[in-house]
């Protein structure tokens, strides 16, 4: 028997990925980070 139509059984949550670079001074280089859902993860 064919399956009846239903949505996938899980929900996809869309989150904004924000890359940023922050200058912390001439002799300290820069911090490059990745923020996912408001939390810096890299």
């Amino acid at each position: 028997d064919a399956e009846f139509r239903h949505d996938s059984g899980y929900e996809v949550h869309h989150q904004k990925l924000v890359f940023f670079a922050e200058d912390v001074g001439s002799n300290k280089g820069a911090i490059i980070g990745l923020m996912v859902g408001g939390v810096v993860i890299a």
């Epitope: 028997d1 399956e3 009846f4 139509r5 239903h6 949505d7 059984g9 929900e11």
Partner: antibody, heavy 123, light 112 residues
Framework: QVTLKESGPALVKPTQTLTLTCTFS??????????VGWIRQPPGKALEWLAH???????SYNPSLKSRLTISKDTSKNQVVLTMTNMDPVDTATYYC???????????????WGQGTTVTVSS | DVVMTQSPLSLPVTPGEPASISCRSS???????????LEWYLQKPGQSPQLLIY???NRFSGVPDRFSGSGSGTDFTLKISRVEAEDVGVYYC?????????FGQGTKLEIK
């Protein structure tokens, strides 16, 4: 509030084509995930699923009746139409339409039903 | 087709007592999306069917909490913890996982 109402002839002759209309309010068939189906119940017997149509015009039929059934929709009129060809006395039943909506935040079950319309097939 | 078999077909119950209806499917009704689309409907005398339980164990809005559904695979149960007079009618299990969608034969609950 959500309502559905079936309409059509009370009596049809054998070999004729039955046309039933489900007119609904309180929701729209242009809404993503929305669908309307047909179910019938012969006198004193169990329920039998016939067909279903979705907002995107995808359709599903009971294979045992597929050659006789056509389901269609008129979104602007808030109507779903079921036609059944070559009617026979065994098709005498109460015919119901019911709403079913896909979606993770939806019930995904037949949550609202019409009152039913009784069709007798006799010469 | 998936055959849905209910038992008992007739169920006389004394008000205040519990009641249980069994529904067995001839094959698994687990959908590929991980959900089991097993539903219970009640058809009160002279009325249209009404939804009680969806996806095995979820009560529809407005359904009293004395109704509960359980099961998995091919074995499902509807329980009424304390039957009331207004619960009389025919109870149908229904699977919406595979085409054709199919109902059980119905269980007629009556008050003793």
């Amino acid at each position: 509030q959500v309502t559905l109402k079936e309409s059509g002839p009370a009596l049809v002759k054998p070999t004729q084509t039955l046309t039933l209309t489900c007119t609904f309010s309180g929701f729209s068939l242009s809404t993503s995930g929305m669908g309307v189906g047909w179910i019938r119940q012969p006198p004193g017997k169990a329920l039998e699923w016939l067909a279903h149509i979705w907002w995107d015009d995808d359709k599903s039929y009971n294979p045992s009746l597929k050659s006789r059934l056509t389901i269609s929709k008129d979104t602007s009129k808030n109507q779903v139409v079921l036609t059944m060809t070559n009617m026979d006395p065994v098709d005498t039943a109460t015919y119901y339409c019911a709403r079913r909506q896909l979606g993770l935040r939806s019930i995904d079950a037949m949550d609202y039903w019409g009152q039913g319309t009784t069709v007798t097939v006799s010469s | 087709d998936v055959v849905m078999t209910q038992s008992p077909l007739s169920l006389p119950v004394t008000p205040g007592e519990p009641a249980s209806i069994s529904c067995r499917s001839s094959q698994s009704i687990l959908h590929s999306n991980g959900n089991t689309y097993l539903e219970w409907y009640l058809q009160k005398p002279g009325q249209s069917p009404q939804l009680l339980i969806y996806k095995v164990s979820n009560r529809f809005s407005g359904v009293p909490d004395r109704f509960s559904g359980s099961g998995s695979g091919t074995d499902f149960t509807l329980k009424i913890s304390r039957v009331e007079a207004e619960d009389v009618g025919v109870y149908y299990c229904f699977q919406a996982s595979r085409v054709p969608l199919t109902f059980g034969q119905g269980t007629k609950l009556e008050i003793k």
